[in-house]
C-alpha cells in the first residue's frame, strides 16, 4: 500500500522522500526565507481501506510574510492553550486542549494568518462529555455578567459576575456550571 | 509529559529471539509514534524502526528489515519490539521513544532495556 | 540512508567556558535536526528541536543554528551538569543520529 505524490506547495519546499511511499511515511513541508507557513507541516501517508494510501490532511500553505499581521486572542469555551502566547505574528502558531470532561473538535492548532485571522480551518470546539447542562444565568440588576449568550452552559465553565460603577458586588462573583447541571451558586446583586 | 517503562533485562542465546515492551502512560497513546533506537556498549544511537498504533503499520530501517518486527496493543498501551537470529553484536540497551504529532523528534524516551546476547 | 556526522569526536572545555559542536549532513535536512544530551546510564534528553528550537524546561544557556548541511550546537557558558555526550538527528528522511561528541571537563 503507497500514497501518490505529496500535494505540491507554492514558495516552498518537500522533504526528501522515495517511491512508492510507504504507508507510514512522514513528509515535511517548509517555505522559503520571506514566507510563512499556515497548517501543519507534516503530512502522513495512512490507509483507510487496506488497500489504498492516502495523505492524512491537507498540505499547509506558504504565505508572504507580512509584518504587520496580528492575530487577536483565540478563545475556546471548554478548553485551554497549551502552546503560543501574545503577541501573535504572522505564522505564530497556538495549540489546544480540552479542560477535564469535555472533548475536541476540529483540529487543536490555528495558525496566524496575513489577514489578522486565525486558520487555515476553524477555532476547535470543547464539547461537554455530560448530557446535562446548566440553565441560562439571569442578568443581574446594576451589572453585568461574562455570558451573554441566552443559551445553556456545559459543566466545566463559568460566569463571572461584575457591577457598574458605584455598585457593590454581593455574593459569588465567579459561579460554576457543574456536572450535575445545577449552578455553584445563586447569582449576586449589586448593591449601592 | 508522557512515561514510557520498558520490561527488565534480558540475556539471550546466538539465534535466539528477543521481545522488548515499552508501556506508555499519559497523552493518547493510539496518536503518537513509538520508535525502537538501540545502543551498543561505548557506542552510538541507532534507530530501528517505528509504529504509530493507530495506523497499526510500522516502518523499519532497512538495516533491521526482515529481522525486527515491531507491535503495539492499543488496549493496554504498549509498544513491542521483537529482534530475532540473534547475534553477539546485538548486545545493547533498546529504548522506545515517543514522537508527537510526527514531529520526527523524541521528547519521551524509555528507562532502556539491556539485552545480552551470548552463548 | 542520510549519513550525519559529528564533529570533535571529544571536546574538553573549562567550567564557565562556552563550548561549540558541530554536526553536518550528508544531503540538505533543511531545519529537520534535533540535539539530544545523554548522562552515562541514562536515556537521551531531548534538548533542541527543529535546529533552533529549545525543548521544553531546557536553559537559555542551550542554542541551535543552522540548516542544510551545516548545524552547530553551542552551550554559552558550561555547567558542571552539562559535562555528557551530545547527538544530533535528522527527520528530513526517516531518522538518523550522528556518532555522538563526548563533552568533558578540561
Known amino acids: 500500500i503507497s500514497c501518490g505524490s505529496p500535494p505540491p506547495i507554492l514558495n516552498g519546499r518537500i522533504s526528501y522522500y522515495s517511491t512508492p511511499i510507504a504507508v507510514g511515511t512522514v513528509i515535511r513541508y517548509s517555505c522559503s526565507g520571506t514566507f510563512r507557513l499556515i497548517g501543519e507541516k507534516s503530512l502522513l501517508c495512512i490507509t483507510k481501506d487496506k488497500v489504498d494510501g492516502t495523505w492524512d490532511k491537507p498540505a499547509p500553505k506558504c504565505e508572504y510574510f507580512n509584518k504587520y499581521s496580528s492575530c487577536p486572542e483565540p478563545i475556546v469555551p471548554g478548553g485551554y492553550k497549551i502552546r503560543g502566547s501574545t503577541p501573535y505574528r504572522h505564522g505564530d502558531s497556538v495549540t489546544f486542549a480540552c479542560k477535564t470532561n469535555f472533548s475536541m473538535n476540529g483540529n487543536k492548532s490555528v495558525w496566524c494568518q496575513a489577514n489578522n485571522m486565525w486558520g487555515p480551518t476553524r477555532l476547535p470546539t470543547c464539547v461537554s462529555v455530560f448530557p446535562l447542562e446548566c440553565p441560562a444565568l439571569p442578568m443581574i440588576h446594576n451589572g453585568h455578567h461574562t455570558s451573554e449568550n441566552v443559551g445553556s452552559i456545559a459543566p466545566g465553565l463559568s460566569v463571572t459576575y461584575s457591577c457598574e460603577s458605584g455598585y457593590l458586588l454581593v455574593g459569588e462573583k465567579i459561579i460554576n456550571c457543574l456536572s450535575s447541571g445545577k449552578w455553584s451558586a445563586v447569582p449576586p446583586t449589586c448593591e449601592e | 509529559q508522557v512515561q514510557l517503562v520498558q520490561s527488565g533485562a534480558e540475556v539471550k542465546k546466538p539465534g535466539s529471539s528477543v521481545k522488548v515492551s515499552c508501556k506508555a502512560s499519559?497523552?493518547?497513546?493510539?496518536?503518537?509514534?513509538i520508535s525502537w533506537v538501540r545502543q551498543a556498549p561505548g557506542q552510538g544511537l541507532e534507530w530501528m524502526g517505528r509504529?504509530?498504533?493507530?495506523?497499526?503499520?510500522?516502518n523499519y530501517a532497512q538495516k533491521f528489515q526482515g529481522r525486527v518486527t515491531i507491535t503495539a496493543d492499543k488496549s493496554t498501551s504498549t509498544a513491542y519490539m521483537e529482534l530475532s537470529s540473534l547475534r553477539s553484536e546485538d548486545t545493547a540497551v533498546y529504548y522506545c521513544?515517543?514522537?508527537?504529532?510526527?514531529?520526527?523528534?523524541?521528547?519521551?524516551w524509555g528507562q532502556g532495556t539491556l539485552v545480552t546476547v551470548s552463548s | 540512508e542520510i549519513v550525519m556526522t559529528q564533529s570533535p569526536a571529544t571536546l574538553s572545555v573549562s567550567p564557565g567556558e562556552r563550548a561549540t559542536l558541530s554536526c553536518r549532513a550528508g544531503?540538505?535536512?533543511?531545519?529537520?535536526l534535533a540535539w539530544y544530551q545523554q548522562k552515562p546510564g541514562q536515556a537521551p534528553r531531548l534538548l533542541i528541536y527543529?535546529?533552533?528550537t529549545r525543548a521544553t524546561g531546557i536553559p537559555a544557556r542551550f542554542s541551535g543554528s543552522g540548516s542544510g548541511t551545516e548545524f552547530t550546537l553551542t552551550i554559552s557558558s558550561l555547567q558542571s551538569e552539562d559535562f555528557a555526550v551530545y547527538y544530533c538527528?535528522?527527520?528530513?528522511?526517516?531518522?538518523?543520529f550522528g556518532q555522538g561528541t563526548k563533552l568533558e571537563i578540561k
Open positions: 521513544a515517543r514522537e508527537d504529532d510526527s514531529s520526527g523528534y523524541y521528547q519521551d
Open positions: 544531503q540538505s535536512i533543511n531545519s529537520y
Open positions: 527543529d535546529a533552533s
Open positions: 509504529i504509530i498504533p493507530i495506523l497499526g503499520i510500522a
Open positions: 499519559g497523552g493518547t497513546f493510539s496518536t503518537y509514534a
Open positions: 538527528q535528522q527527520y528530513e528522511y526517516w531518522y538518523t
